[in-house]
């Protein structure tokens, strides 16, 4: 039975040209996290595998940085980065947990960042 829950940064906004941290946290389970995939719609952004470390998809290498923790940092944001992002936690023995973050990239310099979420 899957008892865990994913907490995320939720809906967030950021300014064009800036950067943002996407973070998820899996709680309420003792399952072992074997891998976390970060995806944007149907595109794989990055993988953090517990055995191997981080791999950033080649098309995002210039603008995506690993971490902090299992999170992902998006840099040099453009309006085209607006959309849904998913953290997919592969765990044993529970299986897969998915969290959703909606990022809006604004032209304005008055973009309000969502509440910063910190992994304890």
């Amino acid at each position: 039975m899957m008892t865990g829950t994913i907490e995320t940064t939720g809906n967030i906004s950021a300014e064009k040209g800036g950067s943002i941290i996407l973070q998820c946290h899996l709680s309420s389970t003792t399952a072992q996290v074997t891998q976390v995939n970060w995806e944007q719609q149907d595109q794989l952004l990055a993988i953090c595998n517990a055995d191997l470390g981080w791999h950033i998809s080649p098309s995002f290498k210039d603008r995506v940085a690993p971490g902090p923790g299992l999170g992902l940092t998006l840099q040099s944001l453009t309006v085209n980065d607006t959309g849904e992002y998913f953290c997919i936690y592969h765990t044993y023995p529970d299986g897969t947990y998915t969290g959703r973050i909606f990022l809006e990239v604004l032209e304005s310099s008055v973009a309000e960042h969502g509440a910063r979420f910190q992994i304890p």
Partner: antibody, heavy 120, light 107 residues
């Protein structure tokens, strides 16, 4: 005692194929990621590929992507590297190495290496 | 990709000398930096992982420091068995790049 023993190297013509093996002992093989690292004669070290403990996740260097395939057989405690479409620049000593996931993904144990020579 | 620049590429030193090798990453890699020693005809050996942690069985005369982009490997008192080539490597993200190496030779 952790031991890694590579085999399968040799002389092959450009465009040819070769399969390297790495026999592991002294640790729970399926609990560790594994990597191949190569060293051209008189040159430095170059990471080639990595595979997770379960074998479900693989990473490759751009220079070998689409030509080399890493795999493992945990029932035989053996790591493999299938090398196709070999080029002169693939000439190197190939080392298998264990990935220490709990130690910042360093390569904590290495085999003695096997020499691959690509020449006509 | 992250570039790792090691310096010097070679150095001459005497037994008992303090030796320092530096490694610079082209972008911040936190503490995901490892150091290896390689002797001619042999496989590399892990000395330091996570920038400053000594691998089990490695003599305490070896130490590592740094974070972000700049890292240092120090041998406090060079011993005859320390003459070798030393490599840094980032394990921050693929392709897990190695530095070009530093050859430590006998003066």
């Amino acid at each position: 005692e952790v031991q890694l023993l590579e085999s399968g190297g040799g002389l092959v013509q450009p465009g040819g194929s070769l399969r390297l093996s790495c026999a592991a002992s002294g640790f729970t093989f399926g609990s560790y990621g594994m990597s191949w690292v190569r060293q051209a004669p008189g040159k430095g070290l170059e990471w080639v590929s990595s595979i997770s403990g379960s074998g479900s996740t693989t990473y490759y260097a751009d220079s070998v992507k689409g030509r080399f395939t890493i795999s493992r057989d945990n029932s035989k405690n053996t790591l493999y590297l299938q090398m196709n479409s070999l080029r002169a620049e693939d000439t190197a000593v190939y080392y298998c190495a264990r990935v220490a996931g709990s130690s910042g993904w360093a390569f904590d144990y290495w085999g003695q290496g096997t020499l691959v020579t690509v020449s006509s | 990709d992250i570039q790792m620049t090691q310096s010097p590429s070679s150095l001459s030193a005497s037994v008992g000398d303090r030796v320092t090798i530096t490694c610079r990453a082209s972008q911040a890699i936190s503490n995901y930096l490892n150091w290896y020693q390689q002797k001619p005809g042999k496989a590399p050996k892990l000395l330091i992982y996570a920038a400053s942690r000594l691998q089990s069985g490695v003599p305490s005369r070896f130490s590592g420091s740094g974070s972000g982009t700049d890292f240092t490997l120090t041998i406090s008192s060079l011993q005859p068995e320390d003459f070798a080539t030393y490599y840094c490597q980032e394990s921050y993200s693929t392709p897990f790049t190695f530095g070009g190496g530093t050859k430590v030779e006998i003066k």
